[in-house]
């Protein structure tokens, strides 16, 4: 009775269970009753990352420098190349097919998380007591100056975009 299902790492072909090719190898010829599955290693620029019956290996991803990409991890016969973005840029998608410049946090916002090759800058509004007066991809919200510690008084209140202005104590009091 021919099989209708096969074991793990096997496939059914013409009523026969054949071994799948291991990662890093492609299928050349199905097995027979007498011969094991014929598999062949992928070439240097190719890979297959699963047990498979593929007749062609997949091409390694190309990290195109014209798109701001660079190699983070070189591909093997079993893994694809991993691309990342050059300094100052990050991926536009999870598959990292192109790069865009990191965004800057506008005045009134500070950097919560600095961008990486794969993620953009995360900004947060400066809370009360903090400010940012620059457009920056690195600077966090800075605390207002403490006039009291300098034996000064607040002459002008701070905002999320400006520091407080300190002045001398009113001597007439």
């Amino acid at each position: 009775e021919p099989p209708t299902a096969c074991r793990e790492k096997q496939y059914l072909i013409n009523s026969q269970c054949c071994s799948l090719c291991q990662p890093g190898q492609k299928l050349v010829s199905d097995c027979t009753e007498f011969t094991e599955t014929e598999c062949l290693p992928c070439s240097e620029s190719e890979f297959l990352d699963t047990w498979n019956r593929e007749t062609r290996c997949h091409q390694h991803k190309y990290c195109d420098p014209n798109l701001g990409l660079q190699v983070q991890q070189k591909g093997t016969s079993e893994t694809d190349t991993i691309c990342t973005c050059e300094e100052g840029l990050h991926c536009t998608s999870e598959s990292c097919e192109s790069c865009v410049p990191h965004r800057s946090c506008l005045p009134g916002f500070g950097v919560k998380q600095i961008a990486t090759g794969v993620s953009d800058t995360i900004c947060e509004p400066c809370p009360v007591g903090f400010f940012s007066n620059v457009s920056s991809a690195f600077e966090k919200c800075r605390p207002w100056t403490s006039c009291e510690t300098k034996d000064l008084v607040v002459q002008q209140a701070g905002t999320n975009k400006t520091d407080v202005v300190c002045g001398p104590q009113d001597r007439q009091r």
Epitope: N14, S29, D30, C31, T32, E33, F34, T35, E36, E38
Partner: antibody, heavy 117, light 109 residues
């Protein structure tokens, strides 16, 4: 390169024995089934026997069953055909061939066996 | 046992002509497990076509196979001088035995 080379042929008297060898190179011999196919002078191809890659499964043509034995030594990359009780009708060129799901994709150059008194 | 009958026995043609060789099976060949081989005098057979219609590696595209079930055809679109030889079909679906056809000789007219 992938190659099969037969040897052991010759002239032998009826009723006697002969052992043919087929030396394989250029591929992983232990992964492939192997066949013997023969061709009588001026005639067509006749399949003789097959053996599986690990040697456990063997089949024979009715014309040689009980007289011929196919075997292999994977450590020596060699296929054998032990031929006993030879008859005049066994006279032929004997080829070894590699088994695949594509048919017999690699053949040796053949070795001539002549059974004559 | 599947019996394969090849026709014609001999085909006399000139270079550049089209050759059509037939192979008829006594019962259906499962999965189209039918191969075609070429044999020249003093040489071993060479696998041309497998699975009835797939060309083996390195075989020129003037060779093509077709058919299914019990009727199969090998076509050589334009005969080259090196194509004059004997051609055998073989079934490898039902065994034992693996059977060959009687052969078709393609000779120069």
């Amino acid at each position: 390169q992938v190659q099969l080379v037969e040897s052991g042929g010759g002239v032998v008297q009826p009723g006697r024995s002969l052992r043919l060898s087929c030396a394989a190179s250029g591929f992983t011999f232990e992964k492939y089934g192997m066949h013997w196919v023969r061709q009588a002078p001026g005639k067509g191809l006749e399949w003789v026997a097959v053996i599986s890659y690990e040697g456990t499964s063997k089949y024979y043509a009715d014309s040689v069953k009980g007289r011929f034995t196919i075997s292999r030594d994977n450590s020596k990359n060699t296929l054998y055909l032990q031929m006993n009780s030879l008859r005049a009708e066994d006279t032929a060129v004997y080829y070894c061939a590699r088994d695949t799901s594509r048919g017999h994709d690699i053949w040796g150059q053949g070795t001539m066996v002549t059974v004559s008194s | 046992e599947i019996v394969l009958t090849q026709s014609p026995g001999t085909l006399s043609l000139s270079p550049g002509e089209r050759a059509t060789l037939s192979c008829q099976a006594s019962q259906s060949v499962s999965y189209n497990y039918l191969a075609w081989y070429q044999q020249k005098p003093g040489q071993a057979p060479r696998l041309l076509i497998y699975g009835a219609s797939s060309r083996n590696n390195g075989i020129p595209d003037r060779f093509s196979g077709s058919g299914s079930g019990t009727d199969f055809t090998l076509t050589i679109s334009r005969l080259e001088p090196e194509d004059f030889a004997v051609y055998y079909c073989q079934q490898y679906s039902d065994y034992p035995p693996f059977t060959f056809g009687g052969g078709t000789k393609v000779e120069i007219k």
